[in-house]
Amino acid sequence: FERTRSLQDPCSNCPAGTFCDNNRNQICSPCPPNSFSSAGGQRTCDICRQCKGVFRTRKECSSTSNAECDCTPGFHCLGAGCSMCEQDCKQGQELTKKGCKDCCFGTFNDQKRGICRPWTNCSLDGKSVLVNGTKERDVVCGPSPADLSPGASSVTPPAPAREPGHSPQ
């Protein structure tokens, strides 16, 4: 089958890193600078991705593979193949259109990216709050009040926010 295909389509012989040049009797020509072909039998080479601005080059383009980008310090990748760079925030913040914004009461973010998440609802597991949550850290759940030995006590959770209504812990 391969031999038949080769006889019918001379382009199938062109390896990755080349293209089948119709202007030159379908000779396999090397990809021009700043272009690549990652598979054989291609009639054109693809233009290399350029990592500009907030993007920086993680892997240079070669004749057989595209360039790969990541983000400059202070930014992180989003999307397939790092299609976007998004600004980092501090722990205890999340990114909005206005920029980095402190987590709302009842939420936390322990990373420089992503969104603020609610504190764990300890009562769901029949536990109580051992350590209060902050903007940067989740609450720490401890044994339920009934499990505590005499004299021991757990931290009283802060009053839930009114707007929006965060569930009591």
């Epitope: 999340e94 990114l95 259109k97 969104i115 998440r117």
Partner: antibody, heavy 121, light 111 residues
């Protein structure tokens, strides 16, 4: 493929409760907010509240505090919304929706097909 | 608190351009992401525009989003309107990063 599949239509009596489910597939259930939104017949969209399935943390719209309860079962990737003390004005289509984790003011990228809850005596 | 106001209805002939307005009552529209959903009868909403002007995969280029600080409004523009574009359209933003706010919806009628 990301999907949110909701439970079927319900007819309830005033004063009773309803529990709507939203089964997620095609993504990591614990890493995205699930929002609950409702739409009364011929009306617009109204936020009920939301849950972070990763730890069960919840937020409720002021109008629904004390009446709505959100839970999530991570073993089945299913979120639940229970609404108690039903009245006729709770008749609506109830939607679950997923919010991406890119930014704090992001859109809802996937929605369930909706569950019609009819409250009638 | 944040409120978004939309006209109840917009009518347009096939092939013409429709523009749906979403007006922010307070604050600066430039500080808020606005998202747009299309909803057809008996169906769930579908994202047409997110983060002001971005189009999800599969949404035709006829749909575009923009905003104008002088009128403190966001806009959904549909160029070359087709019969299948007849639907309700909702804008969406946030009061706080937890609390979503929706416009009242605009019914687009294709004459």
């Amino acid at each position: 493929e990301v999907q949110l599949v909701q439970s079927g239509a319900e007819v309830k009596k005033p004063g009773s409760s309803v529990k709507v489910s939203c089964k997620a597939s095609g993504y990591t259930f614990t890493s995205y907010y699930i929002y609950w939104v409702r739409q009364a017949p011929g009306q617009g969209l109204e936020w009920i509240g939301n849950i972070w399935p990763g730890n069960g943390g919840t937020f409720y719209g002021e109008k629904f505090m004390g009446r709505a309860t959100f839970t999530a079962d991570t073993s089945t990737s299913t979120a639940y919304m229970e609404l108690s003390s039903l009245r006729s004005e709770d008749t609506a289509v109830y939607y679950c929706a997923r919010r991406p984790d890119y930014s704090g003011d992001d859109y809802f990228d996937y929605w369930g097909q909706g569950t019609l809850v009819t409250v009638s005596s | 608190s944040v409120e978004l106001t939309q006209p109840p209805s917009v009518s347009v002939s096939p092939g013409q351009t429709a523009r749906i307005t979403c007006k922010l009552n307070s604050g600066n529209i430039g500080s808020y992401y606005v998202h747009w959903y299309q909803q057809k009868p008996g169906q769930a909403p579908v994202t047409m525009i997110y983060r002001d002007d971005k189009r999800p995969d599969g949404i035709p280029e006829r749909f575009s989003g923009s905003s104008d600080s002088s009128s403190n409004s966001a806009f959904l523009t549909i160029s070359g309107v087709q019969a299948e574009d007849e639907a309700d359209y909702y804008c969406h933003s946030y009061d706080s990063t937890i609390t979503p706010v929706f416009g009242g919806g605009t019914k687009l009628t294709v004459l």
